[in-house]
């Protein structure tokens, strides 16, 4: 008889036998035979396998190294890896989140368009006409210039993208 060249889904071919793959969370101990099924064992503490597999070793959970600014966002299970994120004020340098960098601040003349998260940096935008930012900040948006008119005052010094307008009293009409 012809041995199989392909097996079913969730099986693998070895020694002309179609053996069951180990389910996620388990590793291979021994291949199947004509009389015995594949022997699998659960992954140990701090280990995982996230697919149907024939691996003889489980993978170690990712370590969220606090020295790199990392902390655990989601604890790993026997079927999933640990997910790391960054401490407050820091964000991941890559999708894998293997290290963190400090959130960037927006310089004077720029405001925060989008506040940083654990996985994305601060997004800054230049303050448009009518708005300013006089600080370096990771949180502050561009502020609108003060409206002198609403205070019954007049503009004494024009605003810039870095400074607010300076208001002053209106000149009194002389008799």
């Amino acid at each position: 008889p012809e041995p199989p060249t392909a097996c079913r889904e969730k099986q693998y071919l070895i020694n002309s036998q179609c053996c069951s793959l180990c389910q996620p969370g388990q590793k291979l101990v021994s291949d199947c035979t004509e009389f015995t099924e594949t022997e699998c064992l659960p992954c140990g503490e701090s280990e995982f396998l996230d697919t149907w597999n024939r691996e003889t070793h489980c993978h170690q959970h990712k370590y969220c190294d606090p020295n790199l600014g990392l902390r655990v966002q989601q604890k790993g299970t026997s079927e999933t890896d640990t997910i790391c994120t960054c401490e407050e004020g820091w964000h991941c340098t890559s999708e894998a989140c293997e290290s963190c960098v400090l959130h960037r601040s927006c310089s004077p003349g720029f405001g925060v368009k989008q506040i940083a998260t654990g996985v994305s940096d601060t997004i800054c935008e230049p303050c448009p006409v009518g708005f300013f930012s006089n600080v370096s900040s990771a949180f502050e948006k561009c502020h609108p210039w003060t409206s002198c008119e609403t205070k019954d005052l007049v503009v004494q010094q024009a605003g810039t993208n870095k400074t607010d307008v300076v208001c002053g009293p209106q000149d009194r009409l002389r008799a």
Epitope: P1, P3, P4, C7, R8, Q11, S16, Q17, C18, C19, S20, Q23, Q26, C32, E34, F35, T36, E37, C40
Partner: antibody, heavy 122, light 107 residues
Framework: EVQLQQSGPDLVKPGASVKISCKTS????????MHWVKQSHGKSLEWIGG????????SYNQKFKDKATMTVDKSSSTGYMELRSLTSEDSAVYYC???????????????WGQGTLVTVSS | DIQMTQTTSSLSASLGDRVTITCSAS??????LNWYQQKPDGTVKLLIY???SLHSGVPSRFSGSGSGTDYSLTISNLEPEDIATYYC?????????FGGGTKLEIK
């Protein structure tokens, strides 16, 4: 059509032996392991063992190691099981069944014979 | 040996009922479980293999599920021809072992 045709009922005396046959048809005999299962009256099923027709390899339930011997005749696509030193405990229905040798159907015993009643009585 | 326990030895149900038969193993068996039907005349048929795969020719009203040590066979719409005894069987370890059986009767 897959068929496993077993020999007829047997009445045997204590201490004697009996050989049950299981003639197969409708499939390639060497592509399936032949297994044997015991069912005592009103009881559940017990796996006795299995034999690989291609190479004669066997696996026995330890409980039946000294009781049963499985053989095959590839030329007639027939399996045999001999039971020896019979006692009243061996009175039961014995089934032959099969499992695809390469495991594509996992370890399913997918077709069964009709059973052979063996009665041990003096 | 792995012990297979079918706690309900007999079960009475009405035609059209949804019936669930359970089976538990004395240790984890990795879904390595089959279900068989034995008719009153002694005929044995495979219904489900590897916990949930339906054997060819078996009506779709039969389904299997479970994991670890606990497994079940469900008949979704009981028919008269389903009167039989149902057995679970593990193949995780040698020797293969069967449950004690659950005899299904019609009310």
């Amino acid at each position: 059509e897959v068929q496993l045709q077993q020999s007829g009922p047997d009445l045997v005396k204590p201490g004697a032996s009996v050989k049950i046959s299981c003639k197969t048809s409708g499939y390639t005999f060497t592509e399936y392991i032949m297994h044997w299962v015991k069912q005592s009256h009103g009881k559940s099923l017990e796996w006795i063992g299995g034999i690989i027709p291609n190479n004669g390899g066997t696996s026995y339930n330890q409980k039946f190691k000294d009781k049963a011997t499985m053989t095959v005749d590839k030329s007639s696509s027939t399996g045999y099981m001999e039971l020896r030193s019979l006692t009243s405990e061996d009175s039961a229905v014995y089934y032959c069944t099969r499992r695809e040798v390469y495991g594509r159907n996992y370890y399913a015993l997918d077709y069964w014979g009709q059973g052979t009643l063996v009665t041990v009585s003096s | 040996d792995i012990q297979m326990t079918q706690t309900t030895s007999s079960l009475s149900a009405s035609l059209g009922d949804r019936v669930t038969i359970t089976c538990s193993a004395s240790q984890g068996i990795n879904n390595y479980l089959n279900w068989y039907q034995q008719k009153p005349d002694g005929t044995v048929k495979l219904l489900i293999y590897y916990t949930s795969s339906l054997h060819s020719g078996v009506p779709s009203r039969f389904s299997g599920s479970g994991s670890g040590t606990d497994y079940s066979l469900t008949i979704s719409n009981l028919e008269p021809e389903d009167i039989a005894t149902y057995y679970c069987q593990q193949y995780s370890n040698l020797p293969y072992t069967f449950g004690g059986g659950t005899k299904l009767e019609i009310k």
